[in-house]
Structures are given as C-alpha cells and as structure tokens.
Interface confidence: medium
C-alpha cells in the first residue's frame, strides 16, 4: 500500500536499520526510499528533543509486516518509503535550507557570490555531496561569502546543526544538472587501481556500473567477470574512488572490465533498474519466500510486487511436474545485491523491477513531413505529439515532443500569428491524423514559452515550451523522450530519425500517418558550406543525405530529431528550417537541444 503522507508527532517504534541526518522529513523519506531495505522512517525535528545532537536525525526502519507500532512523540515526523508507490521517484533535492549547517568533510573552501553559485560549484565537483554557504550577514568577517564543499562516506551529513546566517543544500548531480563529463564506455580487459570504498556481487559489468552510480562515494569501478581466474573474486564489483576523481592507473587484466559512475548523467540512462535475466545462475541471499509459479517472468513480477524482495532465483519445473510450475525464491540482503552468485546451477535469476521507477520515464525501452520516409507504427515514437490550431479551422500546425508530464518541447516559429494558447490543442498518442475527431481527448495549453532571443528560425533560438493545462499519464503510447545530458557533448550519434506528419514533397499536404526517416547528422562545418548565406551556429545541428531524398518538410516543424544512444532515445534536435525539402546538398537544420538544456530546466522547474 502506498502511503505518501507524513505523520506529525508520531514515532515508529523499533525496526531500526540505520540512522542518518537529513535537513527535513521530506528528505528523510527520499533517503529511506533509496535505501535497499528501508520501508518506514522517523524523523526528529528541533522541538522533539532537548539534545541538539538528536535534531535532524532520520531513523531508517524495516518491518516484516511493513508496519510498526505508533507512539505519540512531540516533534517527531514519521512516514513510509515510496518503494510501495507506483509514481516516479527522484533523488533530486533543490531545496536550500536556511540557518542550517550540514556537517561533513570540508575539502574545498572558496569565495562565491551566492548560494546558487556555491550549489553549482558543488554540482560540478566530482566529490561534492552537499555544501554550506556563509552569507554576507555571517558574523565572522573572514568567513563571509565562503562556499564549503563537503562529502561523507554515505553521501548524507554526519550531523546537522542550527547556525545563523548560513545556508546549506545538496549537489544537483541527481537532477541531471552537472557539467561533469559523462563517460559511458566500459573498458574490457582493464582494471583500475586506486582505493576500493566498497565491494558487492554483480552478475555483469552493467549492474556493477549501476551500483557504482547509486553509491555516493563511487566514481569508477572494476568488475571481475565469471571467467576471472581467481574463483573467490568472480562476479566481484569493486567500487572505487581517487583524489583526482579519475583512475590514476589502468592495469591490463584479462576478464576484468572497468568503467565510470554515471552520476553526472543519471537522467539519460537507466541507472537503478536491472531488468535482465541471468540464466543458469543462482543469486544467494536471505530467503523471503518460496512460491510455485510458471516461468521466470512470473517470478520477477512476484518479486517486484513484494516490497521487501530485492532479487530472486527461479528453479524451473522438472518435466511434467507440478503443472509446469517452478520454484520462485524471493530474496533480500543488507545492500540489495546477492551475497554470492553461483553459475551452472540451472536457475534463472534477476532483480526486482520496483527500482525502475527511480529512473527517468524517458529511459523506458519502447517498441523495437518526412520526405522519403516510411509510415510509423503505433507506439514507435511515443513522445511525438501533434499540435493543432483551432483558428480559423482546426488543422495540424506543428509537431512537438513530450519531455515531462506537463511539458511539450517544440519550435518557436510555430507560433507566428498565434495570439493565445487558448486556440491550441495537443494530441498525444496519435498515429493517424484521421483518429482526431471532435470528441477526441486533447490537452489544452496553459502557457507558451518562447525563447526571448528568438527572432526567426534561420537565426536560431527556434525553441519553445508548451505548459499543458493537465498532466500526462505515461503509457506505452505516450511517454517522454530524454533530453541529452550535458556530459554527452562528445557523443557521436549514428542512429537518428526525424518524424512528423509533414509534407512528403515541397508541394504536398499533411500526411495522415506519422512518417519516419533515418537521417545522418552532418557536421556544422559541412552544413555551413551548404548554407553560405546563413550563419550555422553551435546552437544548431544539421542532418541530411548529401544526395537528398530524405528530410523534414512543412508540417514537421517543432517535431523531434530523435537519436538512439546506449539503448536510450534522446531529443537531439527540433525541426527548424531548411532550403526546400530533401534537396541535394541542403541538409535540414534543427535546434541543437543540448545547447538549451539549461534554458529548458530553468523554465520547467521554475
């Protein structure tokens, strides 16, 4: 059962598994949600105790029955983990706490103009978990405007105290706001030296990487595969750190793999969710339950629905035995990982999918005007929307992309002559324009936000946001696309598609079925050569075939240039302008979304 409300002046008795310090009950609930075993918590506010050392304590709790006795206690705030809930969970905490000092190791001290600048510094520093900023009013002259970057072993403060004229807050890495490099490569036959901060068992290097990303102190990792010669170290995932933030030495080791935490690109790749099945593999751990089910998928479903289950092993049924039902062993451990991994046992193992909701919805796998394009199938481009105007008559105006449950990203030039958002309708989950009838449900537009530097498409800043009047419920046919991560500046996209209902040739009509075309990206230098009369800026991105034949065209404007990278679709471009349609040596020009990520986040999170 999902319980989101907080219980004031209530203390949950017993079940303690860990105590951390958090600046608020809300943050305590998030910490509990991300802890592998925490189901309930009690937070102690200032008024709950005479002893200031007990203030801001967040006691994480577990219970076999998923509940604990309630005791009245003034100042205590208790609640439940969001693990039991189906909504998306984020570790992102943008709150700034006034007159509080979160304690940790102060490893960097520098002057900053504002708390925001200090928070940005923390977000862009590989080691920083949280910061304290002494304001201009701070009594001690030499400490005014000082920004202290801090870290701890757990990522949470070692204590929190009241301190006048300071503010404190967390790194925004988990909000996808870091400018740190995002290194996605996994390096084969490589071990990184440097100190190990922890080790866990993992079935493959990708699970190891996700665990590293989720661990507050892990910056890079080394994974010893099943083929590793030393048996005791097989499937061992070493979580590592270094002072510089980079591995000091890489050692060639056959059957070892190494890579980096994805903490600075957390929102553009699945991080928490381990969805694969591991055949002929047993995960060892504390047994929670044994249930007879048909197949390993059913076993995973059972684990996902059992709130305390972290991983499972399915023992397939012996032939003609027990109506084809095998044994499903639901398991857990102190850290969420198997205590040992055994191969060659005939079992099929995997993890709960409960943590998938901690990933951005945009990373969920989807079903495996477009000149020279082909028709799409339903659910193929679930972020694509059709934007209609009702004035003077209803018609398709532009494309757009879902980037949040209340936000559509599109092109600014679509709104030439649009006086009011009232005449706009956004249709979501549509494949054929003919599906749109008078009674077809649509989303009204509350606000049109056009980039204030936009003048005309050809001179850039051709980007706009639509805030919807109501929120979108995500389904297989309507879900968001990921924005490119700022750490992805060096990614070379090779699998890019442009989609829309636009013209199939220069003089044509809007298409009924959503069209798609695979189009290669073109370098800006190459693009500039094709458009001598225009300035192709770094805020634009070009795509097209030298010989022409495939391109976006009238009616596709505002729609996405979607590129698949590491199995995740990213909104790389917004269809903006071009010379004709699909002309030889005239690539399409798109708004380079990466360059506007800050603008998008500023507007959508205001």
């Amino acid at each position: 059962e999902c319980v989101t409300r907080l219980f004031k002046d209530i203390h949950f008795e017993g079940g303690d598994i860990a105590t951390v310090f958090t600046p608020s009950a809300k943050h305590c609930q998030v910490v509990c949600t991300h802890h592998p075993r925490c189901l309930l918590f009690t937070f102690t506010g200032e008024s709950a105790s005479e002893d200031p050392t007990q203030w801001f304590t967040c006691v994480l709790k577990d219970s076999v029955t998923e509940t604990l006795p309630r005791v009245n206690r003034t100042g205590a705030i208790s609640g439940y983990s969001f693990k039991q809930c189906s909504h998306q969970i984020s570790a992102c905490n943008k709150d700034i706490y006034v007159d509080l000092n979160m304690k940790g190791i102060n490893y960097n001290s520098s002057l900053a103009e504002s708390a925001q600048e200090c928070q940005e510094r923390c977000t862009d520093d590989v080691h920083c978990h949280f910061f304290t900023y002494a304001t201009r009013q701070f009594p001690s002259l030499e400490h005014r405007n000082i920004c202290l970057l801090k870290h701890t072993q757990t990522g949470t403060p070692t204590g929190i105290m009241k301190l006048d004229k300071v503010v404190t807050g967390f790194s925004l890495k988990s909000c996808a706001l870091s400018n740190l490099a995002c290194i996605r490569d996994v390096f084969p036959n490589t071990a990184f030296a440097d100190s190990n901060i922890d080790s866990v068992m993992a079935p493959d290097a990708f699970v190891c990487r996700r665990i590293c990303t989720h661990h507050p102190g892990c910056l890079f990792f080394t994974f010893f595969s099943q083929e590793w010669p030393k048996e005791s170290q097989r499937n061992l995932c070493l979580l590592k750190t270094s002072e510089s933030g980079l591995p000091s030495t890489r050692i060639k080791k056959s059957k070892a793999l190494s890579g980096f935490s994805l903490q600075s690109c957390r929102h553009s790749i699945p991080v928490f969710c381990h969805s694969s099945f591991y055949h002929d593999t047993d995960f060892l751990g504390e047994e929670l339950d044994i249930v007879a089910v048909k197949g390993h998928e059913a076993c995973q479903k059972l684990c996902t629905n059992a709130v305390r289950c972290q991983f499972f092993t399915y023992a397939p049924a012996q032939a003609s035995c027990n109506e084809g039902k095998g044994k499903c062993y639901l398991k857990l451990s102190s850290n969420g990982s198997p205590t040992k991994i055994l191969r060659g046992t005939g079992g099929i193992s995997g993890y709960t999918l409960r943590l998938c909701k901690m990933d951005n919805e945009c990373t969920t796998k989807i079903k495996p005007r477009i000149v020279g394009g082909t028709a799409s199938v339903r659910g193929e481009w679930p972020w694509q929307v059709t934007l209609h105007t009702t004035s003077p008559t209803q018609r398709h105006l532009c494309g757009g992309s879902i980037i949040g449950n209340q936000w559509i990203l599109t092109a600014a030039h679509c709104f030439y002559g649009v006086e009011s958002p009232k005449i706009l309708r956004v249709y979501i989950g549509i494949l054929n324009q003919s599906e749109i009838k008078e009674d077809t449900s649509f989303f009204g537009v509350q606000e049109i936000i056009i980039h204030d530097q936009y003048k005309m498409a050809e001179s850039g800043y051709d980007i706009a946001l639509l805030k919807l009047e109501t929120t979108v419920n995500y389904t297989d046919s309507q879900r968001p696309i990921c924005l490119p991560s700022k750490g992805d500046r060096n990614v070379i996209y090779t699998d890019c598609w442009v989609t829309g209902w636009g013209y199939r040739k220069l003089r044509d009509k809007i298409q009924n079925t959503l069209q798609k075309a695979k189009i290669p990206l073109v370098t800006n230098d190459e693009c500039q050569k094709r458009y001598r009369g225009h300035k192709i800026t770094h805020k634009m991105i070009c795509a097209g075939y030298r010989e022409g034949g495939k391109d976006a065209c009238k009616g596709d404007s505002g729609g996405p240039l979607s590129c698949k990278h590491n199995e995740v679709w990213h909104l790389v471009g917004i269809t903006s302008w071009g010379e004709g349609c699909a002309q030889r040596e005239r690539p399409g020009v798109y708004t380079n979304v990466l360059e506007y990520v800050d603008w998008i986040l500023e507007k959508t999170q205001a």
């Epitope: 890489r250 060639k252 060096n490």
Partner: antibody, heavy 119, light 108 residues
Framework: QVQLVESGGGVVQPGRSLRLSCAAS????????MHWVRQTPGKGLEWVAL????????YSGDSVKGRFTISRDNSKSTLYLQMNSLTAEDTAVYYC????????????WGQGTMVTVSS | DIQMTQSPSSLSASVGDRVTITCRAS??????LNWYQQKPGKAPKLLIY???SLQSGVPSRFSGSGSGTDFTLTISSLQPEDFATYYC??????????FGQGTRLEIK
Amino acid sequence: QVQLVESGGGVVQPGRSLRLSCAASGFTFSNYEMHWVRQTPGKGLEWVALIWYDGSNKYSGDSVKGRFTISRDNSKSTLYLQMNSLTAEDTAVYYCTGITGTEDAFDVWGQGTMVTVSS
Amino acid sequence: DIQMTQSPSSLSASVGDRVTITCRASQSISSYLNWYQQKPGKAPKLLIYAASSLQSGVPSRFSGSGSGTDFTLTISSLQPEDFATYYCQQSYSTPPITFGQGTRLEIK
C-alpha cells in the same frame, strides 16, 4: 593514408611557453586515444601525456606534470600540447602518436617537431 | 612505475645473422609488451604488439616472444634496412607508459 603532422616547435627561452599542434588525417581522429612522446637528443623515448578519445581523461608524466597540458579539438582533428615553464631538460623532438588498434600500441606516429629550450 | 630494461644496449651484427634483443620488466606485465624500430631522424615504427603479434606490413623475419617479465625480439636473418635502434614498451600498467632505454643495432 593515415597521417599525423606536428607543428609549433622552435627555439624558446627557459621559463617561456610553447604550444605544439598535431593535425591528423586519413582516420577517424575522434575515435582514438592520442599521446605525446618525446626524445631528447641522442637519448631514448619518454612518454609525455595522453588524452582519451573524447577528451574526458588526461594524464601526464611526472617530469611535466603541472607544466604541460594535453588537449584536443575533435572537430578539427587536432591534438595540442601546451608547454609552460620550459627548462633545458625539455629540449627534445616531440612526437604525436596514437593508438588506433585494439592493443595499447602506438601504431601511428608523426614525423616529430624539435623544441629547443635555450637562453 | 614499471621499469623496462633492454639488453644489450648496443650490438654489432652482419647481414644474414640471427639477432636477439631482450627486454625485462620490473614486475609481471603479462603479454602487454610492444617493440618499435627507429631509424635516425625518423619516428619510431611499431613492429610487434602484445609480445608476439606482428604488425601488418612488417616482414616475417621479425618475431617476438615471452610473457610475464622476460621478452625477446628476434630478427631471423638480418637485412641491410634492419640496422636501427629498437625499443620495447609496456602497456600493462598505464599511465605512465614506459619504454626500455633502447638497443642500437650496428653493422659489424
């Protein structure tokens, strides 16, 4: 064909700076790790610095740490070495080299550029 | 750091001779060892990678062997164009990347 061409060498006074460039052609520069290796007159080879294919990681040898900075511009297929606080010990032929194969071996080299540090 | 020691530091041989140059690592480097040839005024050229794999375009008279700490470069029948300086290099633990001090092969 695969080619690396260094430039920017010359005679410089101690304490001054110099920037070497290395222009790559004939291969996809942005896919590969690049290095600088130097050779002092009549002596052996000494590794100077390396940079990952995407510029995300950089390392340098102890003798140049804090003085030399390696960088790259993948859009221009060019590798750079910014050399500051030069001393007579930095006098050498500087080679730009890359690892384009699957093993960590320098399989592509430039012709080298001479740097002389002298007052 | 891993030290690489070559021997001999120089040697004289005649065309047609079989020549062996050795390289020793200060610790085990598995088979992560490369050999280079350098002629005066020229850049080094990769001959052998991963201890025994011949780089494409390199004549088959060059061969490499060894693993762990001891490695050998062999030229089975010396040709006039083979007179040069030869370097070994470890790529096991990097950075730093370390080279041997070189072996100068001269005409007798």
